[in-house]
Structure formats: structure tokens, C-alpha cells
């Protein structure tokens, strides 16, 4: 049933990192166009990406309104030349996406080490608090603002001269670790949400090493 000479979308997939959220699907359109609708479980259908020939739709503006809601999207297929045309059933073909809860499922983006500072045998490592597209009172929230104590960072650090890694964890964006005096260390961090069942960890940050510009060394 559905519209003549159109095919339903398939492989509807959510791609989301730090709440930047795009719905992707197949197939590439041949003589057809797509419109996307999105709803929460307690809300109603809102149309986006009208009559597009793309196979993706940026739904960030909708999901950031409440990242803890569960969202459902659907993709409608229409004949390219006549989007008002429908089949004998009177409605266009469509396919539903899987449900998506941004707070539980958005991928954690690769973190960045903002700075490190050595004071004697202590090093303070600071992770950049990345800005998201989630807004509150007309300001964009950081990842920490959104996740609070649900988000921790794991620091991996090792002497430049060896391969043995140590780890530290923090539920802020700062680490204070003990180091051996006179040794250079390298650092990498990973964002983690321990309470999650999926997408718990980010990829590791780029490695930063002491003796490079990003850090500051003060011998006390």
C-alpha cells in the first residue's frame, strides 16, 4: 500500500555526539523525496526537513529541548514531482525509527586536555568542558552542566620514558596527581558515564606530554 512508485525508507539510524543529533536512512532517493517527523512519547508529531532529497535530517534543535525525553522519528516518502499525491490508501509510505533517549544514548565526544600545570611533585590536569547545543535560559550548556556527576573523566598518564600507564578518575574536570620529580609525563583522558549500558565511554583524547606548549612547569 502507500504512494505509487515510492519506496519506504529503511535502516533509520540515530547519529548523535554531545547531543548533536542527526537521523540517517536509506535509500538514496530516485524520483522521490522525504519528510521527517519527530515526537516525544508525551508530545506530538513535528515535521522537519520537508521534501528533501537528503538521506539525513538534523534533529538537534528538537532533542535539545529535553534531552531526557525519549524520541521517535519517522520518515515519509513522496513522489518527487507531486508531493500531494498519495496512493489508494490516501497516505504516504513511512517508516519508524528506533526510539532514542539523548541523555542515555548520545555518544560522548572525544575530550580535549585544556591544560596541565606542574607544581613540584603534583600535576593539575584540566579537561576542556565542551559546550553542547543544549540551551537553558538562552545560554548553551557544557557537557558537565548537562550530565553533572553522572559524567566522570578517566586520566591515563605515564612517564615519557616508559610504557606503564597509571589511571585516575574525577567527577569534576580536574585531576591532581602525584608525579616523580624531574620526570616528563604524557596524558590522555576519556569521558565516561558509568551508569549507562550503551555508549559508556568516549574515545581517548589526543595525547599531551609535558615539555610541550600546552603545559606549564613550575619548580617550587
Amino acid at each position: 500500500s502507500g504512494t505509487t512508485n515510492t519506496v519506504a525508507a529503511y535502516n533509520l539510524t540515530w547519529k548523535s555526539t554531545n547531543f548533536k543529533t542527526i537521523l540517517e536512512w536509506e535509500p538514496k532517493p530516485v524520483n522521490q523525496v522525504y519528510t521527517v517527523q519527530i515526537s516525544t512519547k508525551s508530545g506530538d508529531w513535528k515535521s522537519k526537513c520537508f521534501y528533501t532529497t537528503d538521506t539525513e535530517c538534523d534533529l538537534t534543535d528538537e532533542i535539545v529541548k529535553d534531552v531526557k525525553q525519549t524520541y521517535l522519528a519517522r520518515v515519509f516518502s513522496y513522489p518527487a514531482g507531486n508531493v500531494e499525491s498519495t496512493g489508494s490508501a490516501g497516505e504516504p509510505l513511512y517508516e519508524n525509527s528506533p526510539e532514542f533517549t539523548p541523555y542515555l544514548e548520545t555518544n560522548l565526544g572525544q575530550p580535549t586536555i585544556q591544560s596541565f600545570e606542574q607544581v613540584g611533585t603534583k600535576v593539575n590536569v584540566t579537561v576542556e568542558d565542551e559546550r553542547t547545543l543544549v540551551r537553558r535560559n538562552n545560554t548553551f550548556l557544557s557537557l558537565r552542566d548537562v550530565f553533572g556527576k553522572d559524567l566522570i573523566y578517566t586520566l591515563y598518564y605515564w612517564k615519557s620514558s616508559s610504557s606503564g600507564k597509571k589511571t585516575a578518575k574525577t567527577n569534576t574536570n580536574e585531576f591532581l596527581i602525584d608525579v616523580d620529580k624531574g620526570e616528563n609525563y604524557c596524558f590522555s583522558v576519556q569521558a565516561v558515564i558509568p551508569s549507562r549500558t550503551v555508549n559508556r565511554k568516549s574515545t581517548d583524547s589526543p595525547v599531551e606530554c609535558m615539555g610541550q606548549e600546552k603545559g606549564e612547569f613550575r619548580e617550587i
Epitope: S1, S39, S42, G43, D44, W45, K46, K65, A89, G90
Partner: antibody, heavy 118, light 107 residues
Framework: QVQLVQSGAEVKQPGASVKVSCKAS????????MHWVRQAPGQGLEWMGM????????TYAQKFQGRVTLTVDTSTSTAYMELSSLRSEDTAVYYC???????????WGQGTLVTVSS | DIQETQSPSSLSASVGDRVTITCRAS??????LNWYQQKPGKAPKLLIY???RLQSGVPSRFSGSGSGTDYTLTISSLQPEDFATYYC?????????FGQGTKVEIK
């Protein structure tokens, strides 16, 4: 508890407009869509449209497109339905109904009778 | 637009009877089917949503079933307060549409 209280009955001349209000309480107004449904005397229920109070996004039934305008005032948690170019067939009870999911009307106002008569 | 056809349009029954009302949609509505009860001079009241889920506070004698295009509301043992008009409504796709109603009267 959720309550939707609508404005009182109206009598209008053909060609005039009417604006019905629906004051919501007992929940966060911007979280749920508001729908409008009408019922002509002795007839069934007819969906007119809906509005998302968080951003005033609207969807209207094609039959009412261009004649109905849905608005909200979030400061007073009030939804409004304005119907213009009234004709006798618009005589009906007009209901606001709070959505609780796609196309789901869990809570209803008491209804507002609009009579169109010359 | 999706059309709902309700049957019967009216029925007479006695207290204690089992009553079944059917609703047929013009296309697959993927279980987005709701049932409402309306008494004279009152607003409709949600009974069943998403085919079979009982709205909070609604007695368990009301139940719903169905899939695709065909849906059913059943009252297992009719009570005096159940005499009313019942409407099905599809919530799959705007414009949301209602059946024409089934009036349940006392025999």
C-alpha cells in the same frame, strides 16, 4: 491535578470571529501539546489542530487551515483558539484537550458552546 | 485522511451484558488507536489508549484489542454508568480522526 478551564459560551453573527480560551493548571504548561476538538449538536467529534506551547509550532486540519489560529500565552498557561469567517455550520461545542502522546487526548476542558446565528 | 468506521452505530444492552464495539481504519494505524466515552453534556473521557492500555482510573471491565486496521473495545460486564456514547480515534497521523460513535442504550 490537571485542569483545563475554558471561557464561557459565545453567540456570534455569521462572518464574525470568536476566540475561545483554555486555562491550564496542575502541570507544566510548556511540556504538553494542546489540541482543539469540536462537536456540532448531536454530531461526532472533529479534530481542528494542535499547538506545542514550548515553541508555538502548530498543525491544523486542512478543513480549518486559514480560518483557525491557535496561540498560547505561557505566562498565564492559557491556550487560545480563534476561528474566523464564522458560518452557521460552526455552531458547536469547542473543547481544548491536553495531549499525552501522539494523537492522544488524556485531559479535556469542559467545552465552550459557540452559536453562530443572525 | 485516515477514516474510522465504527460499528454498530447504536446498540441496546442490559446490565451485566458483554458488549463489543468495533472500529475499522482505512489504513494500518500501527496500534495508535484510542477509545473515549462521552456522556450527554460532558466532555469525552479517555478509556483506552494505544489499542489496549487502560487509562488510569478506568475500571478493568473495559479492554481493547486489535492491530493493523481492525480494533475492538469490549465491556465485559455492562454497568449502569456505562450507558454512553463511545468513540474510537486514530492517533497515528494528523489530522487525527474519530469514528462516528456508538451509542450504548439500556434495553
Amino acid at each position: 491535578q490537571v485542569q483545563l478551564v475554558q471561557s464561557g459560551a459565545e453567540v456570534k453573527q455569521p462572518g464574525a470571529s470568536v476566540k475561545v480560551s483554555c486555562k491550564a493548571s496542575g502541570y507544566t504548561f510548556t511540556t504538553y501539546w494542546m489540541h482543539w476538538v469540536r462537536q456540532a449538536p448531536g454530531q461526532g467529534l472533529e479534530w481542528m489542530g494542535m499547538i506545542d506551547p514550548s515553541d508555538s509550532y502548530t498543525t491544523y486540519a486542512q478543513k480549518f487551515q486559514g480560518r483557525v489560529t491557535l496561540t498560547v500565552d505561557t505566562s498565564t498557561s492559557t491556550a487560545y483558539m480563534e476561528l474566523s469567517s464564522l458560518r452557521s455550520e460552526d455552531t458547536a461545542v469547542y473543547y481544548c484537550a491536553r495531549g499525552s502522546g501522539p494523537g492522544l487526548f488524556a485531559y479535556w476542558g469542559q467545552g465552550t458552546l459557540v452559536t453562530v446565528s443572525s | 485522511d485516515i477514516q474510522e468506521t465504527q460499528s454498530p452505530s447504536s446498540l441496546s444492552a442490559s446490565v451485566g451484558d458483554r458488549v463489543t464495539i468495533t472500529c475499522r481504519a482505512s489504513q494500518d494505524i500501527r496500534n495508535y488507536l484510542n477509545w473515549y466515552q462521552q456522556k450527554p453534556g460532558k466532555a469525552p473521557k479517555l478509556l483506552i489508549y494505544h489499542t489496549s492500555r487502560l487509562q488510569s482510573g478506568v475500571p478493568s471491565r473495559f479492554s481493547g484489542s486489535g492491530s493493523g486496521t481492525d480494533y475492538t473495545l469490549t465491556i465485559s460486564s455492562l454497568q449502569p454508568e456505562d450507558f454512553a456514547t463511545y468513540y474510537c480515534q486514530q492517533g497515528n497521523m494528523p489530522p487525527y480522526t474519530f469514528g462516528q460513535g456508538t451509542k450504548v442504550e439500556i434495553k
